[in-house]
């Protein structure tokens, strides 16, 4: 699986999950989140050669098409597969609130 | 929706479904499919600017990150959303067989 365990400990050039830290204020302009100040969101990057963790029958076909037509602009793309939630604390006035923001952290990628 | 109805009738530069015809023999090297000789597989292409048909909370966050950090390599990617099956005929010896190949045709795209 193209997950953090594999990708973070390798020098994989193909589609893999990469490290990305997002600072809520600096990178998103969000002042409303109190804690954390930012988080390891990660992102997916890398080419999707035939056959590299392909998602559907279509993406397998497209990768094969790409192999036969190397100059083509039609190719699978490296995108998130498994996403995890992020617990945050924000204030409503003086009152702290805890919320789980769903689908915020990329744990693994796929070629789609 | 970034579907064939919208995308094929517009000059949309952003993420949209594009026309792609795949010839089974020429483009995939597949000789085993008798009918059809090829099919309109389509593909997804185009940038995913803030905020363009984003898929999850993560892709919205990433697009917003990208707007604040234009030089970053972390960005959502245009990938298939709705896929449809393709009916094919192939021969087992002299005997024709009809099969539905699932997830073969792209009907719409999303930024993931």
């Amino acid at each position: 699986a193209l997950d953090t365990n594999y990708c973070f400990s390798s020098t994989e050039k193909n589609c893999c999950v990469r490290q990305l830290y997002i600072d809520f204020r600096k990178d998103l302009g969000w002042k409303w989140i109190h804690e954390p100040k930012g988080y390891h969101a990660n992102f997916c990057l890398g080419p999707c050669p035939y056959i590299w963790s392909l998602d559907t029958q279509y993406s397998k076909v497209l990768a094969l098409y790409n192999q036969h037509n190397p100059g083509a602009s039609a190719a699978p793309c490296c995108v998130p597969q498994a996403l995890e939630p992020l617990p945050i604390v924000y204030y409503v006035g003086r009152k702290p609130k805890v919320e789980q923001l769903s689908n915020m952290i990329v744990r693994s990628c796929k070629c789609s | 929706a970034l579907d064939t109805n919208y995308c094929f009738s517009s000059t949309e530069k952003n993420c949209c479904v594009r026309q792609l015809y795949i010839d089974f023999r020429k483009d995939l090297g597949w000789k085993w499919i008798h009918e059809p000789k090829g099919y309109h597989a389509n593909f997804c292409l185009g940038p995913c600017p803030y905020i363009w048909s984003l898929d999850t909370q993560y892709s919205k966050v990433l697009a917003l990150y990208n707007q604040h950090n234009p030089g970053a390599s972390a960005a959502p990617c245009c990938v298939p959303q709705a896929l449809e099956p393709l009916p094919i005929v192939y021969y087992v010896g002299r005997k024709p067989k009809v099969e539905q190949l699932s997830n073969m045709i792209v009907r719409s795209c999303k930024c993931s």
Partner: antibody, heavy 120, light 108 residues
Framework: DVQLVESGGDLVKPGGSLRLTCVAS????????MHWVRQAPGKGLQWVAY????????YYADSVKGRFTISIDNSKNTLYLQMNSLKTEDTATYYC?????????????WGQGTLVTVSS | ETVLTQSPGTLSLSPGERATLSCRAS???????LAWYQQKPGQAPRLLIY???SRAPGVPARFSGSGSGTDFTLTISSLEPEDFAVYYC?????????FGQGTKLEIK
């Protein structure tokens, strides 16, 4: 230049529905919490609802809870207020406003307002 | 909910005079959860002061805010003709956000 422009206000009968729209421009829309505030004719200001963009956390004043829905279309930089089961006491000019940054905060930019009249 | 009471209801003064507007909260707001707005007929409110004492961008220096706890004051040091309007205080310490009933500042 930051601009908020409301529309959708109209004359409606009690029990009717209306959708207000607020289009934002001149800033990164998804960075600020958005509010609706109303003002009955000749009266003071009353907070109605807020929504946090992208994460879609929303909260309502007790007087509108269950009848009004605040929502956002991030792709269109647009804030909405869907108003159902309207009452005569909902008659007011409705303003959209953005906060300085926190969920509850001072509101630094306001739209010009759109008038909703509920009357039979 | 927190009730804000503004006084006086109407204040009649002349240009050049000093205006002092009061806002009292039914419970303590701390020192930084109060804002002041100016509203002219047919217009939207305009933010003047936030955090009890910080001037919003573009607001003239003649406007100042002070106070903490339950008692807050908006002062206009020397009234200009364009200052005659209705002024509202707003608290954002607790949900729901509430506004005072307003003070009308009129020309004497």
């Amino acid at each position: 230049d930051v601009q908020l422009v409301e529309s959708g206000g109209d004359l409606v009968k009690p029990g009717g529905s209306l959708r207000l729209t607020c289009v934002a421009s001149g800033y990164t829309f998804s960075s600020n919490v958005m509010h609706w505030v109303r003002q009955a004719p000749g009266k003071g200001l009353q907070w109605v609802a807020y929504v946090i963009p992208i994460v879609d956390i929303a909260y309502y004043a007790d007087s509108v809870k269950g009848r009004f829905t605040i929502s956002i279309d991030n792709s269109k930089n647009t804030l909405y207020l869907q108003m159902n089961s309207l009452k005569t006491e909902d008659t007011a000019t409705y303003y959209c406003a953005r906060t300085l940054g926190l969920v509850l905060d001072a509101m630094d930019y306001w739209g010009q307002g759109t008038l909703v009249t509920v009357s039979s | 909910e927190t009730v804000l009471t503004q006084s006086p209801g109407t204040l009649s003064l002349s240009p050049g005079e000093r205006a002092t507007l009061s806002c009292r909260a039914s419970q303590s707001l701390g020192s930084s959860y109060l804002a002041w707005y100016q509203q002219k007929p047919g217009q939207a409110p305009r933010l003047l002061i936030y955090g009890a004492s910080s001037r919003a961008p573009g607001v003239p220096a003649r406007f100042s805010g002070s106070g903490s706890g339950t008692d807050f004051t908006l002062t206009i040091s020397s009234l200009e003709p364009e200052d005659f309007a209705v002024y509202y205080c707003q608290q954002y310490a607790d949900s729901p956000i509430t506004f005072g009933q307003g003070t009308k500042l009129e020309i004497k």
